[in-house]
């Protein structure tokens, strides 16, 4: 049974040519993460697995950097990249938990952080 | 070309055991994780067991826990399952599948290899 | 476990037709549905995963949709090579489980 929930950064706002980290927290469940994907759209970012370590799909290798943590950081920031954003835990023996984060890249330099919520 | 080619299927009598194997090739084997999936004679799919890329985690459904063990030797390109007490519902044939990468069903799968459980 | 029920078991069409085979899951799993191909002598194929993405090397005539508990695979303008039997798997979570298959014949 899937017990857990995930704790995103929410909606965030970040600026043109800055960088953002994206952050997602599974809790209330014991259920061992195997890998964590990071996908934009159904474009696939980057891979944390659990006995290999960060794989950065080669398309964004230039502008997606691992971490801290499962976290995944975004730089060189454009407004292209404007969009939702998800991360995938892959457990065992729960299954899949799904994170989403929508990240609007301003123009202008008054880009705030948005508060935190959950999604079950 | 990806491969994947199963052996040591067999005839074997209630109680007993069998070690299958599967021979990978044309993928770095030692970056996927891997499961094995069996057909029952009536056709049934049912997954029996799942290997992540290093060997550290291992995962079973509840029909085959404590009587299958599956493994895998990444220098040779070989993955494996044990089974033990052996039952007559564990006649199938037994297919070696590739997981995908980002985790996401099973990309390739093998031909085969036939376990019948019979006394 | 999720339960998964495809139907129908049986189907017979004729070449350049569209058809459709349905799944069904006993609770919601999300978008994670995967569609494989079973043909004689040949190893099984992956043609569809999480719901609607085609895998690499599959035909445009292949196409997923759905989510949540129901699910459809649509085969359009069939070719003489796509009679086979077909087979649903939720990848949501473990156990992993299958449909029952359905078999595609030539009318």
């Known amino acids: 049974m899937m017990t857990g929930t995930i704790e995103t950064t929410g909606n965030i706002s970040a600026e043109k040519g800055g960088s953002i980290i994206l952050q997602c927290h599974l809790s209330s469940t014991t259920a061992q993460v195997t890998q964590v994907n990071w996908e934009q759209q159904d474009q696939l970012l980057a891979i944390c697995n659990a006995d290999l370590g960060w794989h950065i799909s080669p398309s964004f290798k230039d502008r997606v950097a691992p971490g801290p943590g499962l976290g995944l950081t975004l730089q060189s920031l454009t407004v292209n990249d404007t969009g939702e954003y998800f991360c995938i835990y892959h457990t065992y023996p729960d299954g899949t938990y799904t994170g989403r984060i929508f990240l609007e890249v301003l123009e202008s330099s008054v880009a705030e952080h948005g508060a935190r919520f959950q999604i079950p | 070309e990806v491969q994947l080619v199963e052996s040591g299927g067999g005839l074997v009598k209630p109680g007993g055991s069998l070690k299958l194997s599967c021979a990978a090739s044309g993928f770095t084997f030692s970056t996927y994780a891997m499961s094995w999936v069996r057909q029952s004679p009536e056709k049934r799919l049912e997954w029996v067991a799942e290997i992540s890329s290093g060997g550290t985690y291992t995962y079973f459904p509840d029909t085959v826990t404590g009587r299958f063990t599956i493994s895998r030797d990444n220098a040779k390109n070989t993955l494996y399952l044990e089974m033990s007490s052996l039952r007559s519902e564990d006649t199938a044939m037994y297919y070696c599948a590739r997981k995908r990468r980002d985790y996401y069903a099973m990309d390739y799968w093998g031909q085969g290899t036939s376990v019948t459980v019979s006394s | 476990d999720v339960q998964i029920t495809q139907s129908p078991s049986y189907l017979a069409a004729s070449p350049g037709e569209t058809i459709t085979i349905n799944c069904r899951a006993s609770?919601?799993?999300?978008?994670?549905l995967a569609w494989y191909q079973e043909k004689p002598g040949k190893t099984n194929k992956l043609l569809i995963y999480s719901g609607s993405t085609l895998q690499s090397g599959i035909p445009s005539r292949f196409s997923g949709s759905g989510s949540g508990t129901d699910f459809t695979l649509t085969i359009s303008s069939l070719e003489p090579e796509d009679f086979a039997v077909y087979y649903c798997?939720?990848?949501?979570?473990?156990?992993?489980?299958f449909g029952g298959g359905t078999k595609l014949e030539i009318k």
């Open positions: 609770k919601s799993i999300s978008k994670y």
């Open positions: 798997q939720q990848h949501n979570e473990y156990p992993w489980t």
